[in-house]
C-alpha cells in the first residue's frame, strides 16, 4: 500500500536528527502526490485512449477545474507571496470534490487514489498553518460539491473517462505551479 510521507523508513528521523520543517513537509507532500498522480495517469492512459484524445476541450468546458492565472500571483512575473498562497489553498480545497470523484474510478490503483486524496487533505492543513491571511480563503459549499459530484457520476462512460483524465492532468499542472511558487516563499 502507498505510504504517506513521514511514514516510510527513509523519512523516519534518526534519534538525533530534527523533524521535518514545515517547508520540507509541504515540498515532500507535493512531490508525493505528484508521484501518485503519475501512477493514476498510467492506469488511465492504459485503460483508454483519452491521453491522446483531441476532444479534451469539449469535455473541459463542462468542468470548472482550478487553474493558476496571472492575477493569482503565482507566476514568475507578478509573483505575490500572500496572494499566491491563498490561491494554492483555495485551489486545493476546490480540487477536493474532484479527488472524491476519482475514488471509484480506479481498479488496480484504488489505494493510490485514496492516498492522493488523504495526502492532499494533509497538505491543505500544512499550508493553512503557513498562511497569515486565512480570511481570504473561501471554502467550497458542501451542497455545491455534493451536486457537482452527482452530476459527474451521472455522465456516460466516455465522459467519465475524459473527466478522470482531465482532473489528473489539471491537478498535476496545479501542483507543479504550486511547487515552483512555494520555493520562492
Amino acid at each position: 500500500a502507498p505510504v504517506l510521507p513521514g511514514e516510510d523508513s527513509k523519512d523516519v528521523a534518526a534519534p538525533h536528527s530534527q523533524p521535518l520543517t514545515s517547508s520540507e513537509r509541504i515540498d515532500k507532500h507535493i512531490r508525493y502526490i505528484l508521484d501518485g498522480i503519475s501512477a493514476l495517469r498510467k492506469e488511465t492512459c492504459n485503460r483508454s485512449n483519452m491521453c491522446e484524445s483531441s476532444k479534451e476541450a469539449l469535455a473541459e468546458n463542462n468542468l470548472n477545474l482550478p487553474k493558476m492565472a496571472e492575477k493569482d500571483g503565482c507566476f514568475q512575473s507578478g509573483f505575490n507571496e500572500d496572494t499566491c498562497l491563498v490561491k494554492i489553498i483555495t485551489g486545493l480545497l476546490e480540487f477536493e470534490v474532484y479527488l472524491e470523484y476519482l475514488q471509484n474510478r480506479f481498479e488496480s490503483s484504488e489505494e493510490q487514489a485514496r492516498a492522493v486524496q488523504m495526502s492532499t487533505k494533509v497538505l491543505i492543513q500544512f499550508l493553512q498553518k503557513k498562511a497569515k491571511n486565512l480570511d481570504a480563503i473561501t471554502t467550497p459549499e458542501p451542497t455545491t460539491n455534493a451536486s457537482l459530484l452527482t452530476k459527474l457520476q451521472a455522465q456516460n462512460q466516455w465522459l467519465q473517462d475524459m473527466t478522470t483524465h482531465l482532473i489528473l492532468r489539471s491537478f498535476k499542472e496545479f501542483l507543479q505551479s504550486s511547487l515552483r511558487a512555494l520555493r520562492q516563499m
Epitope: 530534527q18 521535518l20 520543517t21 517547508s23 520540507e24 514568475q76 512575473s77 520555493r183 520562492q184 516563499m185
Partner: antibody
Framework: EVQLVESGGGLVQPGGSLRLSCAAS????????MSWVRQAPGKGLEWVSR????????YYADSVKGRFTISRDNAKNTLYLQMNSLKPEDTAVYYC?????????????WGQGTQVTVSS | SYDLTQPPSVSGSPGKTVTISCAGT?????????VSWYQQLPGMAPKILIY???KRASGIADRFSGSKSGNTASLTISGLQSEDEADYYC??????????FGGGTHLTVLG
C-alpha cells in the same frame, strides 16, 4: 540584464554594526527569494541568510543567528543585511545572490560583492 | 572545516576529463536532489553551472555535467579547456532550511 550591486561594506571595530544593501535591476525583484553568501579571504563560500520573495520568511546560518537581520524593500528593489555585534570572523566579501525561479536552493545570479573587515 | 568535503585540488590536461567529488550526509547531499555547482574564476564572483544535481544552468556548455550517488555528488568536466582553470564549489540544501557549501576545489589545466 540582471544586476545585483552590493554596497555598505567597510572597516568596522569588533562589536560594531554595518548595514549592507543590494540594489537589484533587470528583473522583477519581488518575484524572487534572495540570500547573502560570504567568502572569507582565501577561503570558501558560506551561506549567511535567506529571505522569501515577499519578505515573510527568513532563515539564518547558526554562525550569525541573533546578530544579523535580513530584510528587503520590494518597492525599492533592494535587499539589506543588518549586521550587529560584529566579530573578526565575520570579515569577508559579502555577495548578494538570487534564487533561481522555481528551483529549491540554487543561486542563478551573484553580485560582485562588498568587502567587510572587522578589526581593531 | 566545511560541511561538504571536496578535494582541495584536481588537475588534467586539455581535452581530458576530470571529476570533482562532494561528500556530504543523508541530511544534505543525500536528502533530495538539491545539489548545485559553482565556478569561481580568479577575482570574480561565483557563477552557477549545475542545479538540482544534474541540470545545466542557462548558457553552460554540455561539457559540464552533474550526478549523485547516495551522499556524494560529482561534477564532471570533459574536453578540458584552459579557461576552465578556476575554483569549483558544490552546495547543497541541508535539512532545517539552510545551505551548506564544500570547501572548494581548485582545477589546474596542465600544459
Amino acid at each position: 540584464e540582471v544586476q545585483l550591486v552590493e554596497s555598505g561594506g567597510g572597516l568596522v571595530q569588533p562589536g560594531g554594526s554595518l548595514r549592507l544593501s543590494c540594489a537589484a535591476s533587470g528583473f522583477t525583484f519581488s518575484s524572487y527569494a534572495m540570500s547573502w553568501v560570504r567568502q572569507a579571504p582565501g577561503k570558501g563560500l558560506e551561506w549567511v541568510s535567506r529571505i522569501s520573495s515577499g519578505g515573510i520568511s527568513t532563515y539564518y546560518a547558526d554562525s550569525v543567528k541573533g546578530r544579523f537581520t535580513i530584510s528587503r524593500d520590494n518597492a525599492k528593489n533592494t535587499l539589506y543585511l543588518q549586521m550587529n555585534s560584529l566579530k573578526p570572523e565575520d570579515t569577508a566579501v559579502y555577495y548578494c545572490v538570487r534564487y533561481a525561479w522555481g528551483v529549491q536552493w540554487a543561486f542563478d545570479f551573484w553580485g560582485q560583492g562588498t568587502q567587510v573587515t572587522v578589526s581593531s | 572545516s566545511y560541511d561538504l568535503t571536496q578535494p582541495p585540488s584536481v588537475s588534467g590536461s586539455p581535452g581530458k576529463t576530470v571529476t570533482i567529488s562532494c561528500a556530504g550526509t543523508s541530511s544534505d547531499v543525500g536528502y533530495g536532489n538539491y545539489v548545485s555547482w559553482y565556478q569561481q574564476l580568479p577575482g570574480m564572483a561565483p557563477k552557477i553551472l549545475i542545479y538540482d544535481v544534474n541540470k545545466r544552468a542557462s548558457g553552460i556548455a554540455d561539457r559540464f555535467s552533474g550526478s549523485k550517488s547516495g551522499n556524494t555528488a560529482s561534477l564532471t568536466i570533459s574536453g578540458l579547456q584552459s579557461e576552465d582553470e578556476a575554483d569549483y564549489y558544490c552546495a547543497s540544501y541541508r535539512r532545517g532550511e539552510t545551505i551548506v557549501f564544500g570547501g572548494g576545489t581548485h582545477l589546474t589545466v596542465l600544459g
